[in-house]
C-alpha cells in the first residue's frame, strides 16, 4: 500500500497552490465562507480536506481541495468531520488558507511531511 | 501546458519484449504519480500500472504482474513501462497518463492523457 | 476481483437527459471518476471525485455517487456528447475501469 509520508514535492506543490491563494486575492476568498477551523498539531490534511469540502462553487480553492485528498488516505464527504475539529469555532475560508499555509511550510522546513 | 508523448510502440513477435516511455513536460513531473492504461482494438480500458511521485510505490494489474515493469526517471521527466513475454492478448493502445498528486494519488484523478502509442504482438 | 458494471449502451434525443450507471459493490464508499472517449481520441475526464467538473468540462455534465452504484448524467444532450463513457474506480491498490457505454445521440 502507499506510503503514509507524502513525498516532500507534493507537499511543495500544494503550499505553492496556497501561496498562489493568498498572493492572488482580490474580493473576499469565496465570499467570505466561513469554515470549521481544525486543531493543527495532527492528521492535518485530511481535518483541512474536511473542512474545506463544505465550500461549494468556489474556483480559487478546487485545486487545493482536489490536491488534499492526494493527502487522505480515505473518502471525504461534506458534513463529514473529524475529532480535529475546534469545537464551534468558524473562520473565514481566507484565514484557513493563511493558518494552514503557514503550518505546512513549517512542516516542510522541519522535514515532517506525515 | 502538460503534455505527454509515448513512443516505442511497434509489432513484435509473441514471447518478445518492448520498451514505451513518455515524455512529459509543463507540470513538475517528480510531484505526481503517472500510470499506463491500455485499449485492445474494439475493447474497453484496462488500468496496466502506475508509479507514485517521489514515494516510488509501484502498481501492477493482475494481467500483467511479473511480465511488465513501470520506472521513472525524474531527471529526464520521462516514465517507461518494460513489457516482457508479450502475448497476442497485450494487443493494444498504450496511453501513458498523468495520474494523482501525493501518497494518496488515486484519490485525485486521471487529468491528462497521451495520444496512445499502438503494440501490436502477432507472428 | 473489483467489477464496475455498465449498460452497452444508452440513446437518447438532443436536448434529452443522459443517465449511465456504474455499479459496484459499495462503490459509494470509493472516489467514482468518468471518462469521454471519442472515435479515435484520447480519453478524457468529465468528472472527478463523484461530481466534480475538471474546468473546460460543460456544466450539463454533472455526477453523483451512493450505495452501489455512480451514476454520470447529461442534461441537454448534444450531438458532440456522442462518445463512448467509462467509469473508474480504485479498490485493493489497483484501478478498475468499468465496461463502458456508448451514448447515441438519436437524430
Known amino acids: 500500500s502507499p506510503s503514509p509520508v507524502p513525498p516532500s514535492t507534493a507537499l511543495k506543490e500544494l503550499i505553492e497552490e496556497l501561496v498562489n491563494i493568498t498572493q492572488n486575492q482580490k474580493a473576499p476568498l469565496c465570499n467570505g465562507s466561513m469554515v470549521w477551523s481544525i486543531n493543527l498539531t495532527a492528521g492535518v490534511y485530511c481535518a483541512a480536506l474536511e473542512s474545506l469540502i463544505n465550500v461549494s462553487g468556489c474556483s480559487a480553492i478546487e485545486k487545493t481541495q482536489r490536491m488534499l485528498n492526494g493527502f487522505c488516505p480515505h473518502k471525504v464527504s461534506a458534513g463529514q468531520f473529524s475529532s480535529l475539529r475546534v469545537r464551534d469555532t468558524k473562520i473565514e475560508v481566507a484565514q484557513f488558507v493563511k493558518d494552514l499555509l503557514v503550518h505546512l511550510k513549517k512542516l516542510f522546513r522541519e522535514g515532517q511531511f506525515n | 501546458e502538460v503534455q505527454l508523448l509515448e513512443s516505442g510502440g511497434g509489432l513484435v513477435q509473441p514471447g518478445g519484449s518492448l520498451r514505451l516511455s513518455c515524455a512529459a513536460s509543463?507540470?513538475?513531473?517528480?510531484?505526481?504519480?503517472m500510470s499506463w492504461v491500455r485499449q485492445a482494438p474494439g475493447k474497453g480500458l484496462e488500468w496496466v500500472s502506475a508509479f507514485s511521485g517521489s514515494g516510488g510505490s509501484t502498481y501492477y494489474a493482475d494481467s500483467v504482474k511479473g511480465r511488465f515493469t513501470i520506472s521513472r526517471d525524474n531527471s529526464k521527466n520521462t516514465l517507461y513501462l518494460q513489457m516482457n513475454s508479450l502475448r497476442a492478448e497485450d494487443t493494444a493502445v498504450y496511453y501513458c497518463v498523468q495520474d494523482g498528486l501525493g501518497p494518496y494519488f488515486y484519490n485525485y484523478g486521471m487529468d491528462v492523457w497521451g495520444q496512445g502509442t499502438t503494440v501490436t504482438v502477432s507472428s | 476481483s473489483y467489477e464496475l458494471t455498465q449498460p452497452p449502451s444508452v440513446s437518447v434525443s438532443p436536448g434529452q437527459t443522459a443517465s449511465i450507471t456504474c455499479s459496484g459493490d459499495?462503490?459509494?464508499?470509493?472516489?467514482a471518476c468518468w471518462f469521454q472517449q471519442k472515435p479515435g481520441q484520447s480519453p478524457v475526464l468529465v468528472i472527478y471525485?463523484?461530481?466534480k467538473r475538471p474546468s473546460g468540462i460543460p456544466e450539463r455534465f454533472s455526477g453523483s455517487n451512493s450505495g452501489d452504484t455512480a451514476t454520470l448524467t447529461i442534461s441537454g444532450t448534444q450531438a458532440m456528447d456522442e462518445a463512448d463513457y467509462y467509469c473508474q474506480a480504485w479498490d485493493s491498490s489497483t484501478y478498475v475501469f468499468g465496461t463502458g457505454t456508448k451514448v447515441t445521440v438519436l437524430g
Open positions: 459499495k462503490l459509494g464508499d470509493k472516489y
Open positions: 509543463g507540470f513538475t513531473f517528480s510531484s505526481y504519480a
Open positions: 471525485h463523484d461530481s
